[in-house]
Amino acid sequence: SPVPFGPEGRLEDKLHKPKATQTEVKPSVRFNLRTSKDPEHEGCYLSVGHSQPLEDCSFNMTAKTFFIIHGWTMSGIFENWLHKLVSALHTREKDANVVVVDWLPLAHQLYTDAVNNTRVVGHSIARMLDWLQEKDDFSLGNVHLIGYSLGAHVAGYAGNFVKGTVGRITGLDPAGPMFEGADIHKRLSPDDADFVDVLHTYTRSFGLSIGIQMPVGHIDIYPNGGDFQPGCGLNDVLGSIAYGTITEVVKCEHERAVHLFVDSLVNQDKPSFAFQCTDSNRFKKGICLSCRKNRCNSIGYNAKKMRNKRNSKMYLKTRAGMPFRVYHYQMKIHVFSYKNMGEIEPTFYVTLYGTNADSQTLPLEIVERIEQNATNTFLVYTEEDLGDLLKIQLTWEGASQSWYNLWKEFRSYLSQPRNPGRELNIRRIRVKSGETQRKLTFCTEDPENTSISPGRELWFRKCRDGWRMKNETSPTVELP
């Protein structure tokens, strides 16, 4: 398969400039005010110094103004996500001005040339904003720049060059190549707006990272760790198109940031919450589900303004499609003894039973190892709202599913052929809901039976004293 390069291209493609023409090419940036929810409508073009289109097209000086800034393009046409985002903004903010920044001629270049054009496009947007500020009632505080990929850094330049401070910049998977590790004035950064929030959906620690890995905003949200997005695997992509390629996977994961933002606009009754954490591994362990001291936030449009002294990295899990919201649970399992564990880690599954619904069988991901006489923390998440939890079924999977584990089991058997059965003792499970911040303790149904072994299950019910809710802040945030 070809090596992916960008949102819709391959590494070798970037070496080919679009064909030269005999027609003079204007290095142009256009501002298209989307005056209708109908995506086919041509809209109104705004230009600095020309006030008539503002009147003719009913530009609302007192309303919010969104500028949507696309990224690098190999086709020279707007990508299909654009009118989804325009439509979602119109649906959510009926009186708002939605402006599409068309810099296609400058983006339809070698990637390196498009990167070098970001500064001039940022200048153009800043000039437009400076001109609009001369009008009565127009406030820079009402301006929200939304930039995708390379467009996120264009937004950063615009925020940097404008006279004053724009209200908000949202970076949707800001481009990585040529920006990773760059000086703050040469990329999107927190000082480019009053509030800079960022969604990272295609970051890779190996190979080429299409999206930037480093935090570049006041809050930087890494859905699913910021790398492998559900529904974007080769198998998923192959299922939806006949000739699925790595390129399609790249596009799916990179573009997921846009869809998460659209979801936050149109499904505001199903907000997704992210939780502050130092890294993805700690989040996967379930350690970071706190909402104390602004440690959690809504993602996308509904994000609550947070201006931290340091970048705040936040994590969450999502579904494979809209609505993306899942329900996160921290599970603390205290293992107070175990027998004959050998070399291999157990494979545990839990099923949660609630007042609204029951979960599917959920795997407990062991990030490091099961510790004895210690509390082991896990993250599980469900796609449906289970309501109040009533009971938990913990299952230790019997037969090994991996050849590696099977080999270790076999080796363990050879060295200790009469090894008695492996066994763990668990008395209680403490559960915390990320979404409600409620904490519950579950005890084994039979206090005498606390042991679990491969192929067996253990049932837990709410302990008699087990309905506890610590005085923590719930993540419900005020919508903007």
């Epitope: 027609t23 142009s28 995506p39 086919e40 409508h41 073009y45 046409i77 299909n80 001629p105």
Partner: antibody, heavy 120, light 111 residues
Framework: QVQLVQSGSELKKPGASVKVSCKAS????????MNWVRQAPGQGLEWMGW????????TYAGDFKGRFVFSLDTSVSTAYLQISSLKAEDTAVYYC?????????????WGKGTTVTVSS | DIVLTQSPASLAVSPGQRATITCKAS??????????MHWYQQKPGQPPKLLIY???NLASGVPARFSGSGSGTDFTLTINPVEANDTANYYC?????????FGGGTKVEIK
């Protein structure tokens, strides 16, 4: 009303060049892209490429790179298709068709077509 | 490039009857809930004319006898009831990605 008016039929010898024009009226020329479509006798429709009428940047489909050039004169809202080193297989009807920059990009307005015949 | 396969290649229908043309794409032409599939009618000696856009939306001035349906890779154009002046070639087109491609066409004749 919105219309695209194309230049008249052309009879050319192999090796010659031809320039077909497409004049737009009834709308803002630079607000829509201009596409070129070829239809050989008794055949289907074949997209040749398009030109961004604001920036002047052309994009050519795979089979139309080299001898085919799209250009503009925005002052008279006109797009041009020039074919050089004509061959017998270039004999076809050439259509211009506009498409929006936004939305689903279908071709909502077509010119009547220009027949180019290449014969010795 | 996305390949569009139309069937049948030709069709003879009596006035008042229903004509159905199908178009199969080599990969999905849907984006979210939108289908980037369109239908054109081309009468002899005339340019193509837009009939249906986005799979099922009737273009301006097109009679309601024409309808479109489908999603993903399978789309249908239906003419019901067929009239004498519907003799033409009908083409499907996808615009989900460049290059936009056309089906091979279906010739509809009225008996």
């Amino acid at each position: 009303q919105v219309q695209l008016v194309q230049s008249g039929s052309e009879l050319k010898k192999p090796g010659a060049s031809v320039k077909v024009s497409c004049k737009a009226s009834g709308y803002t020329f630079t607000n829509y892209g201009m596409n070129w479509v070829r239809q050989a006798p008794g055949q289907g429709l074949e997209w040749m490429g398009w030109i961004n009428t604001y920036s002047g940047v052309p994009t050519y489909a795979g089979d139309f790179k080299g001898r085919f050039v799209f250009s503009l004169d925005t002052s008279v809202s006109t797009a041009y298709l020039q074919i050089s080193s004509l061959k017998a297989e270039d004999t076809a009807v050439y259509y211009c068709a506009r498409r929006g920059y936004y939305g689903r990009r279908y071709f909502d307005v077509w010119g009547k077509g220009t027949t180019v015949t290449v014969s010795s | 490039d996305i390949v569009l396969t139309q069937s049948p290649a030709s069709l003879a229908v009596s006035p008042g009857q229903r004509a159905t043309i199908t178009c199969k794409a080599s990969q999905s032409v849907d984006y979210d809930v939108d289908s980037y599939m369109h239908w054109y009618q081309q009468k002899p000696g005339q340019p193509p004319k837009l009939l249906i856009y986005a799979a099922s939306n009737l273009a301006s001035g097109v009679p309601a006898r024409f309808s479109g349906s489908g999603s993903g890779t399978d789309f249908t154009l239906t003419i019901n009831p067929v009239e004498a002046n519907d003799t033409a070639n009908y083409y499907c087109q996808q615009t989900i990605e460049d290059p936009p491609t056309f089906g091979g066409g279906t010739k509809v004749e009225i008996k």
